[in-house]
Interface confidence: low
């Protein structure tokens, strides 16, 4: 049987080497002579040779300074045999503890270590974690029990003790309020690492903690007061620019600027941001109206596009926008004037007056009328009052200047502000009719042929209205009735059909048609008839002398 | 010519309410804004108010909640109305006619001025 | 709101004595687009309401007599009175019209010896 106490050995020994560790022995060694040897890493493996044993009385030794963070057990096996070589005994375990000696520095694993924390947060907000290792005996000594500390603070404000580690944990905690990122955006602490829980071997390194924004400053209008003026009626038109400064992290939205116009219910006026700058960019809504007032006094607000996270006083600034007078055209009323006529209204009477209204009350200006377009030439103005005449002879069936009974004119109303404005109205003379006009026959040249000739149908046309036209009656005068006859085509009596009463020689004749509306307003009108050298419809005829009253005039 | 005369109760009681009327002449409430100033006795004189001539007013901002401002242009009067009356609001209150500029560069002085109405606040 | 400060607050002078009054005010009141200084001046005689003299900062009102003179620009404004006379006995008020609240000076009270 083997007997072999315990064996553990120091790392990091001085010597002298070889140093005794202890004494192999065998209780068969009062048998005989016993001779030991051993195998195993350390003995014949490598690291070969760190270990030796004195053949003949078994004592172990270790022949070099061991490192127990390199190897911390060695595992070899003990033999013993007779001075005839036979093993006395079976090959025995024997496990080597290397014990540790604190001869390693805790090592964070990293240089700088980056941590954030929102400014503001309150102590005990957690920000970061710093980790260091250490390669000694963490579960036999306290050579690996790592302390935390914070050496240094940089900057030392507000309190040099703004932050505070956990000893066993390396956590990195608020400790004291008053982080504030515009003032101290960040923070640089030197931690330190100690084996023996402090008292050991030390290392340091950076903790770099970033303070991030939160929205704790609002934005601030500089200047408060701003002035602008903006020309009435004209809307979408800038201002002024209002100023503002926000501490916080620019091109945030704890940064980023949100106008408000506290007394602006009429919708008149807008503020919109500049997004490079945060700049109010104040404009008109829609268009003002110097007559009805001529100054605004603003009172703009402005917050950020997230809330406040703590109670702040919220910036105003006060703008007075001063609206400048534009000479304004005159307006007609109304714009377009419709005004019922007789087409036989006398000549240089009155019609009417169109008049137009000064929008620039305070100006006080004098208006002067005049017609712009008059394409008949019927009418004139008072230049002073508006009032309406005519010069000339109206007439409805002036179809070139009247349309559907209507005449239009456009009278202009000029003012003598400065510039002069002008303003226009449309003035549309309804002309009523008067039987001005008697019926005429159409066409009023009709041929006919020599041989059975076709009868040709007249249409009589009146320009008037009813019921000054149709049914209309038509006669044949000065003997025409003679060689002519004329019957009515339609109950309305609008056309009629004229046929010759006998065959007639080739010439021209002349045919006195008299035509009378229902109104009994008749006109003589002169047919020119054609008979021409052919038989049924008339085709193209010679010229010849005409015939008076239906008889050929000899030539 | 133009005038502006005030008409008040000349005594008010402390939480009480003041109406003042301001009845002018000699121009167009349609077409000129009132101001109102107050002059408390021996003391300056403090703006109150505005009416334009379109009817929309402006208030000094410190005593914007307990004034009113209206006016009937027919009638050519203008009202000033001030709610929950103190000792310190007893002065001498005046009406006057901003000035009118033709192009108009912005900015109102008073160019005539009513002769004012005393005011006192007392129980 | 722009506070106006005129100085003195009261002075006496004799009958023909030319006499300066200044109003400061706690902000500008030229205004860049127009180069105009939204300041007038009013006279308040005892008893009676106030009259105005001067707007603009320096345009006299129709029918003041030209020994008022008013000048200055920006924030210092100064009232002078060439060669005073019995009847200019009164408290003299600036006012500023730049924006609202529209704001008076606490006034000069210039008396005659």
């Known amino acids: 049987d083997w007997v072999i106490p315990p064996i553990s050995c120091p790392e990091n020994e001085k010597g002298p080497f070889p140093k005794n560790l202890v004494q192999i022995k065998s209780n068969k060694d009062k048998e005989g002579k016993v001779f030991y040897s051993i195998t195993g890493q350390g003995a014949d493996t490598p690291p070969v040779g760190v270990f030796i044993i004195e053949r003949e009385t078994g004592w172990l030794k270790v022949t070099e300074p061991l490192d127990r963070e390199r190897i911390a057990t060695y595992t070899l096996f003990s033999h013993a045999v007779s001075s005839n070589g036979n093993a006395v005994e079976d090959p025995m375990e024997i496990l080597i503890t290397v014990t540790d000696q604190n001869d390693n520095k805790p090592e964070f694993t990293q240089e700088v270590f980056k941590g954030s924390v929102m400014e503001g947060a309150l102590p005990g907000t957690s920000v970061m974690e710093v980790t260091a290792t250490d390669a000694d005996d963490d579960v036999n000594t306290y050579n690996a029990a790592i302390a935390y500390t914070i050496l240094s603070q940089d900057p030392e404000l507000p309190d040099k003790n703004m932050f505070t580690i956990n000893r066993n944990t390396g956590v990195i905690s608020v400790v004291t309020t008053g982080l504030d990122r515009e003032s101290f955006p960040t923070y640089t602490l030197v931690v330190q690492a100690a084996d023996l829980q402090g008292e050991g071997l030390s290392t340091t390194a950076t903790a770099v903690i970033t303070v991030t924004d939160t929205n704790d400053n609002p934005p601030i209008f500089n200047p408060t007061t701003y002035k602008g003026q903006v020309p009435e009626n004209e809307a979408n038109v800038v201002i002024t620019t209002l100023k503002v400064t926000d501490a916080d992290a620019p091109n945030t939205p704890a940064w980023e600027a949100v106008y408000t116009i506290l007394n602006d219910d009429g919708g008149q006026f807008v503020v919109t941001t500049n997004p490079v700058n945060n700049d109010g960019i104040l404009k008109t809504a829609k268009g003002l109206d110097f007559e009805a007032k001529q100054q605004y006094i603003l009172h703009v607000a402005v917050t950020n596009v997230v809330p406040f996270e703590v109670s702040l006083t919220t910036s105003t600034a006060t703008v007075t926008v001063d609206v400048l007078d534009v000479n304004e055209a005159p307006i007609f009323v109304p714009p377009e004037k419709r005004v019922e006529v007789s087409e036989d209204f006398g000549v240089g009477q009155e019609i009417t007056s169109y008049t137009a209204q000064e929008p620039d009350t305070f100006m006080e200006q004098k208006i002067t009328y005049r017609i712009w377009r008059d394409t008949a030439n019927w009418l004139e103005i008072n230049p002073d009052t508006g009032a309406i005449s005519t010069r000339a002879e109206l007439d409805r069936e002036d179809f070139e200047h009247v349309k559907n009974s209507t005449y239009t004119a456009l009278i202009i109303a000029t003012d003598n502000g400065s510039p002069v404005a002008t303003g226009t109205g449309t003035l549309l003379l309804i002309l009523s009719d008067v039987n001005d006009n008697a019926p005429i026959p159409e066409p009023r040249t009709i041929f006919f042929c020599e041989r059975n000739p076709k009868p040709q149908v007249i249409n009589i046309i009146d320009a008037d209205l009813p019921p000054n036209t149709s049914p209309f009656t038509a006669e044949l005068t000065h003997g025409a009735s003679a060689n002519w006859t004329i019957q009515y085509n339609d109950p309305t009596q609008e056309s009629i059909i004229l046929k010759p009463k006998m065959a007639l020689e080739v010439g021209d004749y002349k045919i006195n048609l008299k035509l009378m509306d229902n109104q009994n307003k008749d006109q003589v009108t002169t047919l020119e008839v054609s008979v021409c050298d052919c038989e049924g419809a008339a085709g193209v005829c010679r010229k010849a002398q005409p015939v008076e009253a239906g008889l050929q005039i000899p030539a | 010519q133009v005038q502006l005369k005030e008409s008040g109760p000349g005594l008010v009681a402390p939480s009480q309410s003041l109406s003042i009327t301001c009845t002018v002449s000699?121009?167009?409430?349609?077409?000129?804004?009132v101001q109102w100033v107050r002059q408390p006795p021996g003391k300056g004189l403090e703006w109150l108010g505005m009416?334009?001539?379109?009817?929309?007013?402006d208030y000094n901002s410190g005593l914007k909640s307990r004034l009113t401002i209206s006016k009937d242009n027919s009638k050519s009067q203008v009202f000033l109305k001030m709610n929950s009356l103190q000792t310190d609001d007893t002065a001498m209150y005046f009406c006057?006619?901003?000035?009118?500029?033709?192009?108009?560069?912005?900015?109102?002085?008073?160019?005539?001025w009513g002769q004012g109405t005393s005011v006192t606040v007392s129980s | 709101d722009i506070v106006m400060s005129q100085s003195p607050s009261s002075l006496a002078v004799s009958v023909g004595e030319k006499v300066t009054m200044s109003c400061k005010s706690s902000?500008?009141?030229?205004?860049?687009?127009?180069?105009?200084?939204?300041l007038a001046w009013y006279q308040q005689k005892p008893g009676q309401s106030p009259k105005l003299l001067i707007y603009?900062?320096?345009t006299r009102e129709s029918g003041v007599p030209d020994r008022f003179t008013g000048s200055g620009s920006g924030t210092d404004f100064t009232l002078t009175i060439s060669s005073v006379k019995a009847e200019d006995l009164a408290v003299y008020y600036c006012?500023?019209?730049?924006?609202?609240?529209?704001?008076f000076g606490g006034g000069t009270n210039l008396e005659i010896k």
């Open positions: 006057a006619r901003t000035q009118f500029y033709y192009g108009h560069d912005g900015g109102y002085a008073m160019d005539f």
């Open positions: 000699g121009f167009s409430l349609s077409r000129y804004s």
């Open positions: 009416i334009w001539g379109g009817g929309s007013t």
């Open positions: 902000q500008s009141l030229l205004y860049s687009n127009n180069q105009k200084n939204y």
């Open positions: 603009w900062a320096s």
């Open positions: 006012h500023q019209y730049y924006t609202s609240p529209y704001t």
